[in-house]
């Protein structure tokens, strides 16, 4: 998988005018890495991992690019015409990457109350817009402002590209990223499916990188995959990932059944618990936690674009 | 590639017992479990057990529980069988065997011949 | 247990013949079922696994077919070094049992 950086900004505005303040989250290779904390006006590390990829230098620049970003969404939100009254977003998600044959790939998307309107690439600076007549609409209103604005030229989206990039090489250059494994936590349960049927449920957790072989295996051998039910992989929030494989199995046939694990080189084995069976959910229910975004957001329902 | 090197004939007495090894190579001895098969002589072929080498795990055939005991040294990668109270009807070749993780049995030992007599 | 049943205990062919080689289970083994070959110095070979799969390495000329509890092992046109003893396995249920076998000769 190529390494990326995410930059994931939000503003409000409430009956056509335009509040203090955005959100910001930074995702380092789909993990959370930054926050903006609005209370203290600060770019802040998400983890001990994000705090080490720094070391002991400061984030001030993040900071100021964090607010810099924050400043130029509001006045772009500013130029959207057609806000009614009520609660609007505005957000904004840019992203660059660095494949592993060393190219390189920059975007940026537009996103209003949670709808995609506008997106770009930044290397060869070419827009997309659905179409739907809304964000034809809206892209329109926000690239006659971008073009409007001095600022925004076309040396202004390659810094955007080259910024993201010089930052992306700046944090991998500490080798946190690039050096980093967390071997997962596997668990494995049981649950009543039908009559004489058992479902086992083998689940990995706590995990990075993301990649990892999870699979039921009978008597040795892997299960066929349309006997199985994979969960996505997906970020627990610590900065690790979590996911799960279930199948169904006879009951009293447990012993032939293992779960088996295999990541960043290592691999374990994991038996189906004896005994008393349990009543157990055997998916896991996946919460997005937003990590202390703003309480309208959950209220208003305004989509978050992961 | 894979290879599973068996320990030569062994000739015993009734009542004595035997431990027959098996010592994989060419993959991680591991991720994968060994499996232990009997053909007596002009007979087919019967499965004893096996074991999961990462945990020591076992799955027997009823027929030759308390007969045979499987274990695995994961330090030299071999996995070995004891066979207990012999008696001529444990006179057979004893096949380890490997998976690749897809089918049964994908890889087999060359055999070891026990042959139990007075 | 599941009896594994190769009715041809012994079977006579010509080089280039092709063979087929029966094997019925004694209930339903949903296609769990593997076709192993045994020389005559006693080293034995997966061909077939999961009724129809042919194993890395295996010549195009073995293949397997059946459901429920008939299946068989098929050797399109027979060539000197498949004289042997061939042998089916069930793995449906434990414990994994195996058929009599079938020993190919040359007429």
């Known amino acids: 998988e190529p390494h990326s950086l995410r930059y994931n900004l939000t503003v409000l505005s409430w009956d056509g005018s335009v509040q203090s303040g955005f959100l910001a989250e930074v995702h380092l290779d789909g993990q959370p890495f930054l926050r903006y904390d609005r209370q203290k006006c600060r770019a802040k590390p998400q983890g001990q991992w994000a705090e080490d990829v720094l070391g002991n230098k400061t984030w001030d620049r993040e900071t100021r690019d964090l607010t810099g970003n924050g400043k130029d969404l509001r006045m772009t939100l500013a130029h959207i015409k057609d806000q009614k009254e009520g609660l609007h977003s505005l957000q904004e998600i840019r992203v660059c990457e660095i494949h592993e044959d060393n190219s390189t790939r920059s975007s940026q998307h537009f996103y209003y109350d949670g709808e995609l309107f506008l997106s770009q690439n930044l290397e060869t600076e070419e827009w997309t817009v659905p179409q739907s007549s809304r964000a034809q609409t809206l892209a329109m209103n926000v690239r006659n402002f971008l073009k409007e604005d001095a600022m925004k030229t076309k040396t202004h989206y390659h810094a955007m590209h080259a910024d993201c990039l010089q930052e992306l090489r700046r944090y991998l250059e500490s080798g946190v990223v690039l050096r980093r494994t967390v071997p997962p936590m596997v668990n494995v349960t049981r649950s009543e499916a039908s009559e004489g049927n058992i479902t086992v449920t083998c689940r990995a957790s706590s995990f990075y990188p993301r990649n990892i072989i999870l699979t039921w295996r009978q008597d040795g051998v892997s299960l066929s995959h349309d006997t199985q039910q994979w969960g996505d992989v997906l970020p627990d929030g610590n900065g690790t990932y979590q996911t799960w494989v279930a199948t169904r199995i006879c009951r009293g046939e447990e012993q032939r059944f293992t779960c088996y694990m295999e990541h960043s080189g290592n691999h374990s084995t994991h038996p189906v618990p004896s005994g008393k069976v349990l009543v157990l959910q055997s998916h896991w229910q996946h919460h997005h936690h937003h990590h202390g975004l703003n309480d309208i957001f959950e209220a208003q329902k305004i989509e978050w674009h992961e | 590639q894979v290879q599973l090197q068996q320990s030569g004939p062994e000739l015993v007495k009734p009542g004595a017992s035997v431990k027959v090894s098996c010592k994989a190579s060419?993959?991680?001895?591991?991720?994968?479990?060994i499996y232990w098969v009997k053909q007596s002589h002009g007979k087919s072929l019967e499965w004893i057990g096996y074991?999961?080498?990462?945990?020591?795990?076992?799955v027997y055939n009823q027929k030759f529980k308390g007969k045979a005991t499987l274990t695995v040294d994961k330090s030299s990668s071999t996995a070995y069988m004891h066979l207990n109270s012999l008696t001529s009807e444990d006179s057979a070749v004893y096949y380890c065997?490997?998976?690749?993780?897809?089918?049964?049995?994908?890889?087999w030992g060359q055999g070891t011949l026990v042959t139990v007599s007075a | 247990d599941i009896q594994m049943t190769q009715t041809t205990s012994s079977l006579s062919a010509s080089l280039g013949d092709r063979v087929t080689i029966t094997c019925s289970a004694g209930?339903?083994?949903?296609?769990?079922l593997n076709w192993y070959q045994q020389k005559p110095d006693g080293t034995v070979k997966l061909l077939i696994f999961?009724?129809?799969s042919l194993q890395s390495g295996v010549p195009s000329r073995f293949s397997g077919s059946g459901s429920g509890a008939d299946y068989s092992l098929t050797i399109s046109n027979l060539e000197p070094e498949d004289i042997a003893t061939y042998y089916c396995?069930?793995?449906?249920?434990?414990?994994?049992?195996f058929g009599a076998g079938t020993k190919l000769e040359l007429k």
């Open positions: 999961y009724t129809s």
């Open positions: 396995q069930q793995y449906s249920k434990l414990p994994l049992t």
């Open positions: 074991i999961d080498p990462y945990n020591g795990g076992t």
């Open positions: 065997a490997t998976t690749d993780g897809y089918s049964l049995f994908t890889y």
């Open positions: 060419g993959y991680a001895f591991t991720k994968y479990n």
């Open positions: 209930q339903g083994i949903n296609n769990y």
